[in-house]
């Protein structure tokens, strides 16, 4: 019988008492085969973290700063359940740390030196740790003691709780630096008042502070937010302009064997029975013998943290950067206006080898990072382990939802001004063998299908989106008799046709021979009835253009396209017989890397792009013998996006809507995690 006990860690007598009450009340409402609570008492949160890591306890609820400590080795804990505030309909699990300024003040984030600052309090998250952590490498050296460096950075401050004797500049705007509400500039409202009164130029608070202090929109309009990309935005656009997105209070558990499903089962049942306004005798979110015991008194309930979410993703790149800077106190040697090498994310061994070749030839401008799947790469870019990669539109969508931005687009047509003219897109098509003359768009049910990969544009999002509109369910593996759609569940019929060996079967990378455009076409040639690819795939792999044994004798005339009206046409008539227009693949990165990725990639394509005539004697960035490694092989150049610099603008309303509709069929664990952070 599996042990269904969750050992909760308590950090005080009062918490232990509430934990015992929690345990007893849960026993009275949950059947004996259900989850139960045991209580473990420790002296501090850090002791609780160590106890969970050592398997002496299972769970504890922590503030963001401690979630970071819990994640660090050797603890390796992960967030499993989040408290939410507000209503069940609009649950708030995060707050945003923001920098508020007056509208007419005219400076940006990178011009804060010499300004006057208002802080909620020394050592507090939104008011100190996050802004000072993010500004850390701009502080004058020596950066220790930190208070002295901050005092020398700003021309005056109010940082309640600072030592006014040792650091008088930190108390210049609020004499005495009192550490309670007796100091009119203490806390969130106090720091905002410090700005409002004109004492300071910038206030570091949370996004709700301004709404709580100014009910009138006209008054709020006198203020703006400073964004990390050195722009400003209105105060209600905090989701797109903040210093960090911070989780409020989170239950953590072990990453391996951490009982996360059991903890959720327990807390979900607990909130049903003892949540807000549920029971008189025991209340989960109430602390008669103290404040915020086990859970925050202001919490309204729990939400399960998606399993794909590790602590780094949950806390977010900005928060982790800020806290790491403060804790480790290390800054890059290089002057900050110089671009560091771009860390390119490569999928599997084939891409890594090409990336390494690029790295050597780039003379230190490009470094390489490996991941097994596109989603793993996106996650690495999010958390700073990697910086950039080129993605199919379907993954540009996921990357965009995860906060990444498109920076350059692949262009596939030769033109005089390639780099300045991003193209309208390519065509997603359905290819069949000419010999299968009875096959049309209307009778694909029960046939064998070949897809580039799950989540990709031409191979999945467009055909499956159209199919979904017809069949109104997501069981695509029942619609086709079998197929190869790399990235499907291994036991799915949509992995049956795949050719990868062992663990590589149906993997969404080049270890699966039927992956990508060329792979999906090969799947059609060897086993399938229909392949969902791009309009250039057939000509690129026929007529001797692909020398691989399976392709070298293929003839374009032996294949036809399925049109949506139920007819068929020759391959070259794709403009009048396609499923949809697809946005070109694009390079994505984090917002903070946008300028450097743009600059370095434009240099790199001038060195190794289509202008290189002899690819047998020189490194060519856009060539890999039809394998589309790192970039599509038919890329002519990487083009500027001009104003199409967000994922929505880049992909276009129609495509975003189409992928959004298919979201209910999504198996993307990363998309689930990212929409948890930003619904």
């Amino acid at each position: 019988v599996p042990d269904k006990t969750v050992r909760w860690c308590a950090v005080s007598e009062h918490e232990a008492t509430k934990c015992q009450s929690f345990r007893d009340h849960m026993k009275s409402v949950i059947p004996s085969d259900g989850p139960s609570v045991a209580c473990v008492k420790k002296a501090s949160y850090l002791d609780c973290i160590r106890a969970i890591a050592a398997n002496e306890a299972d769970a504890v609820t922590l503030d963001a700063g401690l979630v970071y400590d819990a994640y660090l080795a050797p603890n390796n804990l992960k967030p499993v359940v989040a408290e939410f505030y507000g209503s069940k309909e609009d649950p708030q699990t995060f707050y945003y740390a923001v920098a508020v300024v007056k509208k007419d003040s005219g400076f940006q984030m990178n011009q804060l030196r010499g300004k006057k600052s208002c802080h909620t309090g020394l050592g507090r998250s939104a008011g100190w740790n996050i802004p000072i952590g993010l500004l850390y490498c701009d502080l004058p050296e020596p950066r220790k003691p930190l208070e002295k460096a901050v005092a020398n950075f700003f021309s005056g401050s109010c940082a309640p709780c600072a030592d006014g004797t040792d650091f008088p500049q930190l108390c210049q705007l609020c004499p005495g630096c009192g550490c309670s509400t007796l100091n009119q500039y203490f806390g969130y409202s106090g720091a905002f008042k410090c700005l409002k009164d004109g004492a300071g130029d910038v206030a570091f608070v949370k996004h709700s502070t301004i709404f709580e202090n100014l009910a009138n929109k006209a008054d709020r309009d006198q203020y703006e937010l400073l964004c990390l990309d050195n722009t400003r935005k209105p105060v209600d656009e905090y989701k797109d302009c903040h210093l960090a997105q911070v989780p409020s209070h989170t239950v953590v558990a072990r990453s391996m064997g951490g009982k996360e499903d059991l903890i959720w089962e327990l807390l979900n049942q607990a909130q049903e029975h003892f949540g807000k306004d549920k029971s008189k005798e025991f209340q989960l979110f109430s602390s008669p013998h103290g404040k915020d015991l086990l859970f925050k008194d202001s919490a309204h309930g729990f939400l399960k943290v998606p399993p794909r979410m590790d602590a780094k993703m949950y806390l977010g790149y900005e928060y982790v950067t800020a806290i790491r800077n403060l804790r480790e106190g290390t800054c890059p040697e290089a002057p900050t206006d110089e671009c560091k090498p771009v860390k390119w994310c490569a999928l599997s061994h084939h891409e890594r080898l090409k990336c390494d070749e690029w790295s050597v030839n780039s003379v230190g401008k490009i470094e390489c990072v490996s991941a097994e799947t596109t989603e793993d790469c996106i996650a690495k870019i999010m958390n700073g382990e990697a910086d950039a990669m080129s993605l199919d539109g379907g993954f540009v969508y996921i990357a965009g939802k995860c906060g990444l931005v498109p920076v350059l687009a692949e262009n596939y047509n030769k033109s005089d001004n390639c780099e300045d003219t991003p193209e309208a897109g390519y065509f997603a098509i359905a290819v069949v063998k000419k010999s299968a003359s009875d096959l049309t768009w209307d009778n694909l049910k029960g046939k064998k299908s070949c897809h580039t990969a799950v989540g990709r544009t031409a191979g999945w999002n467009i055909p499956m989106g159209l199919l979904y509109n017809k069949i109104n369910h997501c069981r695509f593996d029942e619609f086709f008799s079998e197929g190869c759609a790399p990235g499907s569940k291994k036991d799915s019929s949509l992995c049956k046709l795949c050719m990868g060996s062992g663990l590589n079967l149906c993997e969404p990378n080049n270890k699966e021979g039927y992956y990508g455009y060329t792979g999906a076409f090969r799947c059609l040639v060897e086993k399938g009835d229909v392949a969902f690819v791009k309009h250039q795939t057939v000509p690129q792999n026929t007529g001797g253009k692909n020398p691989d044994p399976w392709a070298k004798n293929l003839n374009e005339k032996d294949y036809e396209l399925l049109c949506l009206d139920g007819t068929r046409k020759p391959v070259e008539e794709y403009a009048n017989c396609h499923l949809a227009r697809a946005p070109n693949h694009a390079v994505v990165t984090r917002k903070d890397k946008e300028a450097c990725v743009h600059k370095i990639l434009r240099q790199q394509q001038h060195l190794f792009g289509s202008n290189v005539t002899d690819c047998s004697g020189n490194f060519c960035l856009f060539r890999s013998e039809t394998k589309d490694l790192l970039f599509r092989d038919d890329t002519v150049c990487l083009a500027k996006l001009h104003d199409r610099n967000t994922y929505e603008k880049y992909l276009g309303e129609e495509y975003v809507k189409a992928v959004g509709n298919l979201r209910k069929c999504s198996t993307s664990s990363l998309l689930e995690a990212c929409t948890f952070r930003r619904p």
Partner: nanobody, 112 residues
Framework: QVQLVESGGGLVQPGGSLRLSCVAS????????VIWYRQAPGKRRELVAL???????NYRESVKGRFTISRDDAKNTVWLQMNALEPEDTGVYYC??????FGQGTQVTVSS
């Protein structure tokens, strides 16, 4: 001007071994890494192995576990130790570093 000279090739039976060397004249050799390529008759030139300045190495899948690339900066030399050779390894082997043209290469023939 740095020049690269490859040597160590020859005729060897399947299962045999060879050690290729790539020697550079001039200074600053391999500061950004060195790559061994090979070209079989009628085929495209393909990357075999590479070594970066920090000692990081990578290999094409078909030679992994059989070939080892190493370097000695004091001798301005990069080696390619090739074991368990197969007929498919036949070709002209070249070493390359950024900014330096290809050398003459060294012929490796694996045949019984």
């Amino acid at each position: 001007q740095v020049q690269l000279v490859e040597s160590g090739g020859g005729l060897v039976q399947p299962g045999g071994s060879l050690r290729l060397s790539c020697v550079a004249s001039g200074s600053g050799f391999g500061i950004n890494g060195v790559i061994w390529y090979r070209q079989a008759p009628g085929k495209r030139r393909e990357l075999v192995a590479l070594i970066k300045s920090d000692g990081y190495t990578n290999y094409r899948e078909s030679v992994k576990g059989r070939f080892t690339i190493s370097r000695d900066d004091a001798k301005n030399t990069v080696w390619l130790q090739m074991n368990a050779l197969e007929p498919e390894d036949t070709g002209v082997y070249y070493c390359k570093t950024p900014g330096v043209p290809f050398g003459q290469g060294t012929q490796v023939t694996v045949s019984s």
